[in-house]
């Protein structure tokens, strides 16, 4: 039975040209995380495999940094980065857990930074 829950940064905003941390946290389960996929709509940004480590998709290599932890740092943000991001946790023996984050990249310097995992 899947007992775990994923806590995410939820809806967040950031300033164009800045950076943001996407963070998910899996709790309430003793299942082992075997791989975390970070995806944007149908695009794979990065994976972190428990054995093989991080692998960043080539098209994002210049703007995506692994971590902290199982999170993902997006850099040099553009307005086109606005949208849904998904953390997909593969676990044994539970199966797959998915968390959703909505990122809005703002032109102005009044981007709100209120999310739980957000860095200033």
């Amino acid at each position: 039975m899947m007992t775990g829950t994923i806590e995410t940064t939820g809806n967040i905003s950031a300033e164009k040209g800045g950076s943001i941390i996407l963070q998910c946290h899996l709790s309430s389960t003793t299942a082992q995380v075997t791989q975390v996929n970070w995806e944007q709509q149908d695009q794979l940004l990065a994976i972190c495999n428990a054995d093989l480590g991080w692998h960043i998709s080539p098209s994002f290599k210049d703007r995506v940094a692994p971590g902290p932890g199982l999170g993902l740092t997006l850099q040099s943000l553009t307005v086109n980065d606005t949208g849904e991001y998904f953390c997909i946790y593969h676990t044994y023996p539970d199966g797959t857990y998915t968390g959703r984050i909505f990122l809005e990249v703002l032109e102005s310097s009044v981007a709100e930074h209120g999310a739980r995992f957000q860095i200033p």
Partner: antibody, heavy 116, light 106 residues
Framework: QVQLVQSGAEVKKPGSSVKVSCKAS????????IEWVRQAPGQGLEWMGE????????NYNEKFKGRVTITADKSTSTAYMELSSLRSEDTAVYYC?????????WGQGTLVTVSS | DIVMTQSPDSLAVSLGERATINCSAS?????IHWYQQKPGQPPKLLIY???NLASGVPDRFSGSGSGTDFTLTISSLQAEDVAVYYC?????????FGGGTKLEIK
């Protein structure tokens, strides 16, 4: 359900090359590493290399570098392992396997026999 | 390369008895995986990350250990457990397997 189906047995001459295919189904091929492992008759398992199909990124066992090339075709969800300059000691069963929390699904194996 | 040494090479155990297979790494590793291979079949994931049973594996199988010394235990051997067992490390590339332990019924 997850399946990895490999190409059929091959008989090759020393010095030639062989290309083994591994067709994946039942999961999103581009999202997970595929590894290649071989097993000589009556022997143990030997890791050859791996590919992340989503990007084409590869890692190889230094022992095979220059002789092995691993590729993937996302459009057909197929991974390939090509081994060149074959010698008799390359006679083995070659396996592909998906990597998710260790090698959790394996192909059925492809016997490659190198003989003059 | 990290060398994984399994002992014994072969083991004969009576049905219902305990079977123990050892795996020793030439340098310290974080964890290992165990695979079971039956004749004419590909290997099958048995235990991942030292002690976690893979999906569908009976709980008579268990794994333990740390550092350089690891153990696979079958608490009560069944006829279907006859196979070759391999350990594998993912600590340092190239990923290496042990030489295998052939388990038979006495």
């Amino acid at each position: 359900q997850v399946q990895l189906v490999q190409s059929g047995a091959e008989v090759k001459k020393p010095g030639s090359s062989v290309k083994v295919s591994c067709k994946a189904s039942g999961y999103t091929f581009s999202r997970y590493w595929i590894e290649w492992v071989r097993q000589a008759p009556g022997q143990g398992l030997e890791w050859m290399g791996e590919i992340f199909p989503g990007s084409g990124g590869t890692n190889y066992n230094e022992k095979f570098k220059g002789r092995v090339t691993i590729t993937a075709d996302k459009s057909t969800s197929t991974a390939y392992m090509e081994l060149s300059s074959l010698r008799s000691e390359d006679t083995a069963v070659y396996y592909c396997a998906r990597h998710l929390g260790a090698l959790d699904y394996w192909g059925q194996g492809t016997l490659v026999t190198v003989s003059s | 390369d990290i060398v994984m040494t399994q002992s014994p090479d072969s083991l004969a155990v009576s049905l219902g008895e305990r079977a123990t297979i050892n795996c020793s790494a030439s340098s310290s590793v974080s964890y290992i995986h165990w695979y079971q291979q039956k004749p004419g079949q590909p290997p099958k994931l048995l235990i991942y990350r030292t002690s976690n049973l893979a999906s569908g594996v009976p709980d008579r199988f268990s794994g333990s250990g740390s550092g350089t010394d690891f153990t696979l235990t079958i608490s009560s051997l069944q006829a279907e457990d006859v196979a070759v067992y391999y350990c594998q490390q993912y600590h340092s590339n190239p990923w290496t397997f042990g030489g295998g332990t052939k388990l038979e019924i006495k």
